[in-house]
């Protein structure tokens, strides 16, 4: 009689995680009369997968009958495979005994698992910054195999190139990670722009993954600032405009000023976005010439998304302006009621837009 | 280590039925067959019929096949061999065997339950 | 179906002689290069025990005094050495199709 082979035909097969692996295994003697068992590995730590003679296993089960008349074919059938399953699996023959005695083991089978890499997340940097900065983007995804992987970035559909990746671990692993940091520098222009992140792997059969990120959750656009007087009105009353243009994100304070003292602070709230997702407001403020004596040196402070405020200031020449007799109030125009007031305190109101 | 254990020995007239059990442990019960082979007083081996627990697949001695009928019930590991219109020349031991190589050969022996049928 | 026939029926041999007990069957038992043959030993009160499997193949835990051999319709069981452990009756059985067991042959020493 021959001696006994155990020979597992396939070096490898790959299987998609959550699909079922086959590992072939076929004897070429019916000699000696023992068990078949399977292992993942080799050596003493190796794992028991199959035991033909005892034990449960429930993922496991024979391809063909194993009380079949003169079987010699102990192929396995393993179902729902994670990556965790990856690895060497030998078909060990043994002879029957107490305890049974290790004859011969096959070649091995490299089961290696197709799992499919996370949705790529997307995180920007934790602080805003304005145009002409760089900021870092991460992209990170998780649990796939094999280790090859590509990653690219885009910024508006344009490809990136300033970005560093790694896939860890570096050896050998049941399933890798990927971690790719990309450094974009960003323009006035970048409140609607969007960066992607770009995963391919040969599990996804050419439909990459994507994760994005909205440059609107990194960027701060700086407010411009104008100061304008209007044209004089009959009543005295001059017209002065603060125009703030251009700026992301909303969160805007703005505090006007009179010779130095506050007069009314205000916060942007609803305003129109323009095209390119800045906004604009308009704060105007009316002032009663005839209620100062001197000069008004009028401060539009504004403070804008947390920075420190800016301010532009703006000179009204109450000289220019004949003095209304009998009049010691400055007011401001709410409509159509102008009131007087008895003692020397000014009192200011103010109206806004 | 593999066990077969048997039930316990039976006095049944002629004519009725008896139903001899085998419980076995030390390996999974769904992967071999098992055979049962009976013994005269004094005489030899006289295989009866197998059964094959994973689907219930029997072959039966020709002289068998029209009284005896083999069962497994999976679920405690265990084979049943019933045998019917008992005659006197029925006494024997009963032996339930497993194959382990699946060669339709007898690796390991219950130690055999003596049926003794008699008026 | 396969007949199997032993012979003697019965033998004695002395302690430490050789004993030689043989198995005819009525058709050849051989099959894929496999003879379906099989040797038990039963002792008095005890159930059979197998010794040989595929006419040539020792079970795992007999001494190696005993040895199967033949092929086709012709079978022989030889212990090299008896011992008086020995003294049992053995018998022959085929699975070529559904098994069959010899009538068995009685061992006994001289």
């Known amino acids: 009689e021959e001696e006994l082979q155990v020979i597992q035909p396939e070096k490898s097969v790959s299987v998609a995680a959550g699909d079922s692996a086959t590992l072939n295994c076929t004897v070429t003697s019916l000699i000696p009369v023992g068990p078949i068992q399977w292992f993942r590995g080799a050596g003493p730590g190796r794992e028991l997968i199959y035991h033909q003679k005892e034990g449960h296993f429930p993922r496991v089960t024979s391809v063909s009958e194993s009380t079949k008349r003169n079987n010699m074919d102990f192929s396995i059938h393993i179902s729902n495979i994670t990556p965790a399953d990856a690895g060497t699996y030998y078909c060990v023959k043994f002879r029957k005994g107490s305890p049974d005695v290790e004859v011969k083991s096959g070649a091995g089978t490299e089961l290696s698992v197709r799992a499919k890499p996370s949705a790529p997340v997307v995180s920007g940097p934790a602080v805003r910054a304005t145009a002409e900065h760089t900021v870092s983007f991460t992209c990170e995804s998780h649990g796939f195999s094999p280790r090859d992987i590509t990653l690219k970035w885009f910024k508006n559909g344009n490809e990136l190139s300033d970005f560093q990746t790694n896939v860890d671990p570096a050896g050998k692993s049941v399933s890798y990670s990927i971690r790719s940091t990309a450094r974009v520098v960003l323009t006035r222009r970048d409140v609607h722009s969007q960066v992607i992140c770009e995963v391919a792997h040969v599990t996804l059969q050419g439909d990459p993954l994507r994760g994005t990120a909205n440059l609107s959750e990194a960027i701060r656009v700086p407010p411009f600032l104008e100061v304008t007087q209007q044209s004089m009105r009959a009543d005295n009353q001059v017209n002065v405009t603060c125009q703030v243009t251009k700026f992301y994100p909303q969160r805007l304070q703005l505090t006007w000023l009179e010779n130095g003292n506050v007069s009314r602070t205000e916060m942007a709230s609803a305003l129109p976005e323009n095209k390119d997702g800045t906004y604009n407001w308009t704060s105007w403020l009316l002032v009663n010439v005839s209620a100062h004596r001197d000069d008004v040196k009028l401060t539009c402070q504004v403070e804008h998304d947390g920075q420190p405020a800016v301010n532009k200031s703006f000179s009204v020449k109450v000289s220019a302006h004949p003095k209304e007799q009998g009049s010691n109030t400055a007011a401001e125009n709410t409509g159509t009621n102008e009131r007087d007031y008895k003692d020397d305190d000014d009192k200011h109101h103010h109206h806004h837009h | 280590q593999v066990q077969l254990v048997q039930s316990g020995a039976e006095v049944k007239k002629p004519g009725a039925s008896v139903k001899v059990s085998c419980k076995a442990s030390?390996?999974?019960?769904?992967?071999?067959?098992i055979n049962w082979v009976r013994q005269a007083p004094g005489q030899g081996l006289e295989w009866i019929a197998m059964?094959?627990?994973?689907?219930?697949?029997?072959h039966y001695n020709q002289i068998f096949k029209d009284r005896a009928t083999l069962t497994t019930d999976t679920s405690t590991s265990t084979a049943y061999m019933e045998l019917r219109s008992l005659r006197s020349d029925d006494t024997a031991v009963y032996y339930c065997?497993?194959?382990?190589?699946?060669?339709?050969?007898?690796?390991?022996w219950g130690r055999g339950t003596l049926v003794t049928v008699s008026s | 179906d396969i007949v199997l026939t032993q012979s003697p029926d019965s033998l004695a041999v002395s302690l430490g002689e050789r004993a030689t007990i043989n198995c005819r069957a009525s058709?050849?038992?051989?099959?894929?290069?496999?003879?379906?043959i099989f040797w038990y030993q039963q002792k008095p009160g005890q159930p059979p025990k197998l010794l040989i499997y595929?006419?040539?193949n020792l079970d795992s835990g007999v001494p190696d005094r005993f040895s199967g051999s033949g092929s086709g319709t012709d079978f022989t069981l030889t212990i090299s050495s008896l011992q008086a452990e020995d003294v049992a009756v053995y018998y022959c059985?085929?699975?070529?199709?559904?098994?069959?067991f010899g009538q068995g042959t009685k061992l006994e020493i001289k």
């Open positions: 065997a497993m194959d382990y190589g699946s060669l339709y050969a007898m690796d390991y």
């Open positions: 030390g390996y999974t019960f769904t992967n071999y067959w």
């Open positions: 059964i094959d627990p994973s689907d219930s697949e029997t």
């Open positions: 058709k050849s038992v051989s099959s894929s290069g496999y003879n379906y």
């Open positions: 595929l006419a040539s």
């Open positions: 059985q085929h699975s070529r199709d559904l098994p069959t």
